[in-house]
């Protein structure tokens, strides 16, 4: 006879376990989202778990497969795109990553009517970008930096540009700096709404200085990677915008769109293109000193076959307290009259809000207002405008979706998401079908993410698209840390913070504190989102308290906070992290002898400066791929916030804000410096210079490089990185291994 003790009342707690580092590295607790690939007002495509492409009709409630996994597998396709006339699908394979957004791939065209691949006039390989026209099945693609057009998939291609050259001239795709810092896309071509015209950008990088670094690979000699990369103050790419008639492309050829005179008078950028109708296009331009933006509406002149951009259709957006826009200048959303538009920009109180522009920006009608910010305009229909904001309950780190009825007067506002799943869901995005007939809501947290389908007229929930049941079940026996989002009021500044606390947190005990920082201009770290990541593990298993703080320079709390860092990066971001740490110590549960800070990229810069602040607050810290001097970083990003590194502009602060200038101050902290040698974004040069300065100052430090890894330190490097950082922190905090 085996005597078993009766189940104790807290047996559930006994069966629960802490998170392990292995859980995090294996992605055991990752979540899924569901974004419908809308193909009409009531239909969407979705790639099923077994890789079939399935069409769903919301109104009939029916679904059926239009492309089998067998066809996908026959060309090893990892992605697809249905032509708007539903006759063809492109299948994408041989994905080869380039930079953040860009990649090359091989494309196959499949004819759905006869169930065969299109033979004859096959596409060249590898292709840099390919897309269908918005109507029919014309194809535009970029191959070897030139743009080609096909009227039908089986037709021979028409070559639009001929001057494309690697690292010199880019047609229809951005160069490095435009991809990363301006467009945030892999493409620089735009079809008009009915596919009559194709607009594209040409980037001339001929005079841009080149960053060169070694790629070690497996060969006897390393390769050298060369990228035209303008650092602060350097020569920038020269951009031109062209439009071609795709019906008769050979007739007049590409026509250049004129640049507004007030922009063309000095160095400038092109920031975005928005088609309004087939014969009206809107271009946005930005001065190199990025506090003046011009939105220019241009019309097609049939008689001359040219594009005319009258001065009366130029709208100027200027910032007197910082740079134009938030991270980027916002883009317009045009209304049905094809001339007036909705746009987010700062109101007189310094909060970003939706404005309606009918004739001039000066006469703009403010649509939203308050001490919060409108963040994104999703869709404008005849009677509704859908947008997201952080208004609800005054939490800047939340996102709810709102509908404003613009068809009625006065317009009424309704929060679509605020009360749907209030505890679980406070951070939403949305995806709308044609005419906003239906929409999907994707909730990112703070609870387990959930995606739902809704009626665009009534906002009624139709069905759950993805609720992450498996994740929910997997987490049932996991001791997750507790999270709280609160704010500190310090010297008229509000510092929002997120604190991640060990599962058995006890306010009367003392805990080691790790600050995780990013802190870049217009960023936000304190968000009501779900995550099971490295810091969750550090709290759950290793008993650390982790804090994230949004200080000056961060977004969505008004221009006063955002533009506080203008022309002086590296000062207030660091001060605010230090201030927050002091406040956390005052709370009584932090062991002030065991405080660390870590960050990646901009966060690596801030963590390095915090460690070298001379406060004695931090015992140790980690910088992953940090910027070390703003003279080493990209012109478009850096100059937006810092101006130019010239004597008559802001050179002094460029020099004062380097990590190297503070080398001596690292003497009393344990510093771990980490960087990938093939980082195309924040060049290894940054860490090389920190290391050199520390050596010259005879300051001891720890370092790790990752050979041939870029800014993301992906793959096996990720595992090595987090294992290494864990050991470092545990040693710093005297935690047993």
């Amino acid at each position: 006879i085996v005597l078993r003790p009766s189940r104790v009342h807290n047996s559930e707690e006994n069966t629960m376990r802490a998170l392990t580092l292995k859980d995090i590295l294996n992605g055991t607790f990752s979540y899924k989202t569901f974004f419908p690939n809308w193909i009409s007002g009531q239909e969407y495509l979705h790639q099923s778990a077994d890789n079939n492409i399935v069409l769903y009709n919301i109104e009939t409630g029916q679904s059926y497969t239009i492309l089998s996994n067998r066809t996908m597998k026959s060309v090893n396709a990892s992605n697809y795109g249905l032509s708007p006339d539903r006759q063809f699908v492109y299948l994408e394979s041989d994905y080869s990553k380039l930079w953040r957004y860009s990649y090359t791939a091989t494309y196959y065209i499949y004819d759905l009517s006869n169930g065969e691949f299109v033979r004859g006039n096959e596409l060249p390989r590898p292709i840099q970008y390919l897309c269908w026209s918005p109507v029919g099945s014309k194809l535009a693609y970029v191959y070897q930096n030139n743009i080609y057009l096909k009227q039908r998939p089986g037709d021979p291609p028409f070559q639009i540009t001929f001057n494309g050259r690697e690292n010199k001239i880019f047609n229809g795709i951005p160069d490095w700096v435009y991809e990363e810092e301006m467009l945030a896309t892999k493409y620089a071509l735009w079809w008009s709404p009915n596919g009559k015209f194709l607009a594209y950008a040409e980037f001339n990088d001929t005079d841009i200085p080149v960053i060169a670094y070694s790629y070690y690979g497996d060969e006897q000699y390393p390769r050298t990677i060369n990228i035209p990369y303008p650092k602060a103050g350097a020569k920038n790419p020269v951009v031109r915008i062209f439009i071609i008639d795709t019906t008769y492309p050979a007739y007049v050829g590409p026509q250049e769109v004129p640049v507004p005179a007030m922009i063309a008078s000095s160095d400038y950028y092109f920031s975005w293109l928005t088609w309004v109708t087939d014969e009206r296009v809107c271009l946005q331009w930005l001065k190199r000193v990025q506090n003046v933006s011009v939105l220019s509406i241009c019309d097609f002149r049939e008689d001359w076959q040219t594009w005319d951009c009258p001065k009366t259709q130029e709208h100027i957006e200027e910032s007197r307290t910082g740079w134009a826009g938030g991270f980027f200048v916002s883009t317009p959303v045009f209304s049905y009259d094809a001339i007036s538009y909705y746009k987010i920009f700062s109101d007189k109180d310094g909060y970003k809000h939706i404005h309606y522009i009918k004739d001039t920006v000066e006469n703009a009608i403010q649509i939203t207002s308050g001490k919060w910010e409108a963040i994104n305009i999703f869709r404008v229909t005849q009677d509704s405008l859908f947008y997201s904001s952080n208004e609800f309950e005054e939490y800047p780190g939340r996102r709810n979706i709102y509908r404003i009825s613009i068809g009625s007067y006065p317009p009424s506002k309704k929060c679509v998401t605020c009360h749907l799943r209030k505890e679980r869901c406070q951070y939403y995005t949305a995806s709308f079908s044609d005419y906003a007939k239906y929409y999907a809501l994707v909730c990112y947290g703070p609870g387990i993410p959930i995606s739902t389908l809704h009626d665009g007229r009534t906002d009624q929930e139709i069905k759950i698209l993805e609720e992450n049941k498996e994740l929910e079940n997997a987490l049932k026996n996991i001791q997750l840390p507790k999270e709280e989002i609160k704010k500190l009021e310090v010297d008229e500044i509000t510092l929002w913070y997120k604190m991640i606390l060990p599962p058995q947190f006890d306010r009367s005990k003392k805990y080691p504190l790790l600050i995780q920082v990013y802190g870049g201009p217009c960023s936000q770290s304190v968000r009501s989102v779900f995550a099971v990541n490295w810091i969750s593990y550090l709290a759950s298993k290793e008993g650390m308290v982790i804090a994230l703080v949004d200080g000056r320079g961060t977004a969505f709390q008004g221009d006063k906070l955002l533009y506080a860092v203008y022309r002086k990066l590296g000062v207030y971001e660091v001060e605010d992290q230090i201030t927050a740490v002091r406040k956390f110590i005052e709370m009584g549960f932090i062991d002030e002898k065991r405080i660390a800070i870590w960050g990646w990229s901009y966060g690596g810069y801030v963590s390095s400066l915090a460690l070298a602040s001379g406060t004695g607050l931090f015992k140790c810290g980690i910088a992953v791929a940090p910027v070390s001097s703003w003279e080493y970083y990209a012109s478009v990003y850096t100059e937006r916030f810092m101006g130019l590194p010239t004597k008559d502009d802001n050179l002094e602060h460029y020099k004062n804000s380097t990590v190297m200038a503070r080398a001596e101050y690292f003497r009393n902290v344990d510093y771990l410096l980490i960087h990938g040698t093939a980082d195309d974004n924040v060049h290894f040069q940054n860490s090389a210079q920190i290391a050199k300065a520390l050596v010259n100052a005879q300051v001891d430090f720890q370092a790790m490089w990752y050979s041939d890894q870029n800014h993301g330190l992906s793959g096996l490097s990720t595992n090595h990185l987090y294992t290494h950082m864990t050991h470092f922190l545990k040693q710093c905090f005297s935690l047993s291994d």
């Epitope: 009409s40 249905l82 759905l112």
Partner: nanobody, 117 residues
């Protein structure tokens, strides 16, 4: 099992007209986006016209301005009105969802249209 029944085909002189009908039984609703396709002897099947459940239409370049697709949701039927017929329109005409479903029973028998010159 889904049954798509095409009808209305026949022999017609060049320049003439025909109206094809497609009715469904089984699990596929004609409220889905529907299309007409055709296959001429020795050629591959090709798209002719499509209509979304919202009523948006699309046509192959070769039939634009001559053919019109429509639907009667109450009767669960999709039509193809073919005017100004040409000899090159001779084919077996099929209806299916648009884009077509891939299933063993996806395609019906079709209806033969012959245009004589």
């Amino acid at each position: 099992q889904v049954q798509l029944q095409e009808s209305g085909g026949g022999l017609v002189q060049a320049g003439g007209s025909l109206r094809l009908s497609c009715a469904a039984s089984g699990s596929i609703s004609m409220l889905n986006s529907m299309g007409w396709y055709r296959q001429a002897l020795g050629k591959q099947r090709e798209f002719v016209a499509g209509i979304t459940s919202g009523g948006r239409t699309n046509y192959a370049d070769s039939v634009k301005g001559r053919f019109a697709i429509s639907r009667d949701n109450d009767k669960n039927t999709v039509y193809l009105q073919m005017n100004s017929l040409k000899p090159e329109d001779t084919a077996v005409y099929y209806c299916n969802t648009w884009p077509p479903r891939i299933a063993f029973d996806s395609w019906g028998q079709g209806t033969q249209v012959t245009v004589s010159s």
